[in-house]
């Protein structure tokens, strides 16, 4: 588990898995951009690596993360850097190559400590498979039986979107998974570029509502190095 990284708060039992939101059948939950643990990059770029300017990890490829190329990290200038392989130093999950995650400052295999199981559980749920056992989750958190008698309202805890009332989906919200509203036009959404990254997010958003898609905000006032938002826009 990730307990060793989530280091400074008392947790009686293991926290719910990072991620784990259930989405609309056939549509993955939109999750917030992939910086899970704060801290700028302090590592050098790799030679012969073609720089691509970015504001956040999701703008980079599957095998990349977004960070300052210089030691000490001027956050104003960031480019996509090659992901860090197993046993290399890291400061957040996105820095590690696919199949690995950041634990105690080192990229380790997702196979260790059942972490992969948590991600797979998330992916299974995200595509609306309500028949999944969710063993990794249910052993840790017991929902009130009331949840199954009435559909969850906005902000109430959930395991999957079918637990939530119409117009809501089940999505990760920092400490927990709760029922959140399906997004309306103009609301912030998240477009995923990094494969599987939704399994690591702590702020997940629902999908955009009918007739809407998640696109980058067209705003000429925003500087190119700013963190560009995606919003739900008409097709």
């Amino acid at each position: 588990t990730l307990n060793s990284v989530l280091n400074s708060n008392a947790i009686k039992n293991l926290p719910p898995p990072l991620g784990g939101a259930a989405g609309h059948p056939g549509s993955a939950v939109s999750a917030a951009p992939g910086i899970l643990y704060p801290g700028g990059n302090k590592y050098q770029t790799i030679d012969n690596y073609q720089p691509y300017p970015c504001a956040e990890d999701e703008e980079c490829g599957t095998d990349e993360y977004c960070a300052s190329p210089t030691r000490g990290g001027d956050a104003g200038v960031q480019i996509c850097l090659a992901c860090r392989k197993r046993r290399k130093r890291c400061m957040r999950h996105a820095m590690c190559c696919p199949g690995n995650y950041c634990k105690n400052g080192i990229c380790v295999s997702s196979d260790q400590n059942n972490f992969r199981g948590e991600i797979e559980e998330t992916i299974t749920e995200s595509f609306g498979n309500d028949h999944s056992t969710l063993d990794g989750y249910s052993r840790r958190t017991t929902l009130s039986s009331k949840m199954y008698h009435s559909k969850g309202q906005e902000g109430s805890v959930c395991l999957r979107s079918s637990d939530c009332a119409t117009g809501l989906c089940c999505a990760r919200h920092f400490w927990s998974k709760i029922c959140k509203p399906v997004l309306k036009e103009g609301q912030v959404c998240t477009k995923h570029r990094r494969k599987g990254s939704h399994g690591l997010e702590i702020f997940q958003r629902c999908y955009c509502g009918e007739g809407l898609s998640c696109r980058i905000q067209k705003d000429h006032h925003q500087a190119s190095n700013s963190s560009r938002l995606h919003t739900c826009q008409r097709h």
Epitope: A55, S144, G155
Partner: antibody, heavy 116, light 112 residues
């Protein structure tokens, strides 16, 4: 409608203890995470602690860790904050807040004064 | 530690628009695009006005809107009214300490 009512505040000496309660109504208490947030006189808001819907997870601000304990009784729709080893800097209005999508409902607060 | 910086005070006349800023770092606001805003009148409990950057809870006037660019989130109040005079706090989360974090607060004064 959602209602949160805090009680248990008062004057206490440094090193003393106090237990705050928050009675919840108007929503399914057992389906929501709950939090305590405090505000020192004339100061800003400071998050104190949060507890999961089933009490399995608790988190605390560094400033209160090891001294305060959050708990809840879902059968009584009540949230608690046990405060031990109180210090002058703990003087504040303590708010009980429902943590749905962020702190979406708040009580009116109860004043805790730590002074000799 | 994560710290959210807000101006101590802002002011505006009735009918005007004002904007309150909340500045973090690339590790928090700039990184995970999440911020909420609360309004607090003197002697009253805070009230959630905006969540997830730009979403309004039901019952909150559409004169209140949120946005974010880079490491700075903003709360804009248009058509300023006397009852908008209050303290406003931004809020996000610290993913290392697993805690909620509030900005220092901004006192909004409606002139005249």
């Amino acid at each position: 409608q959602v209602q949160l009512v805090e009680s248990g505040g008062g004057l206490v000496q440094p090193g003393g203890s106090l237990r705050l309660s928050c009675a919840a109504s108007g929503f399914t208490f057992s389906s929501y995470w709950m939090s305590w947030v405090r505000q020192a006189p004339g100061k800003g808001l400071e998050w104190v602690s949060v507890i999961s819907s089933d009490s399995s997870s608790t988190y605390y601000a560094d400033s209160v860790k090891g001294r305060f304990t959050i708990s809840r009784d879902n059968s009584k729709n009540t949230l608690y904050l046990q405060m031990n080893s109180l210090r002058a800097e703990d003087t504040a209005v303590y708010y009980c807040a429902r943590h749905g999508i962020d702190f979406d409902h708040w009580g009116q607060g109860t004043l805790v004064t730590v002074s000799s | 530690d994560i710290a959210l910086t807000q101006p101590a005070s802002v002011s505006g006349s009735p009918g005007q628009s004002i904007t309150i800023s909340c500045t973090g770092t690339s590790s928090d606001l700039g990184g995970y695009n999440y911020v909420s805003w609360y309004q607090q009148h003197p002697g009253k409990a805070p009230k959630l006005m905006i969540y997830d950057v730009n979403n309004r809870p039901s019952g909150v006037s559409n004169r209140f809107s949120g946005s974010k660019s880079g490491n700075t989130a903003s709360l804009t109040i248009s058509g300023l009214q006397a009852e908008d005079e209050a303290d406003y706090y931004c809020q996000t989360y610290d993913q290392i300490k697993l805690s909620a974090v509030f900005g220092g607060g901004t006192k909004l004064t409606v002139l005249g």
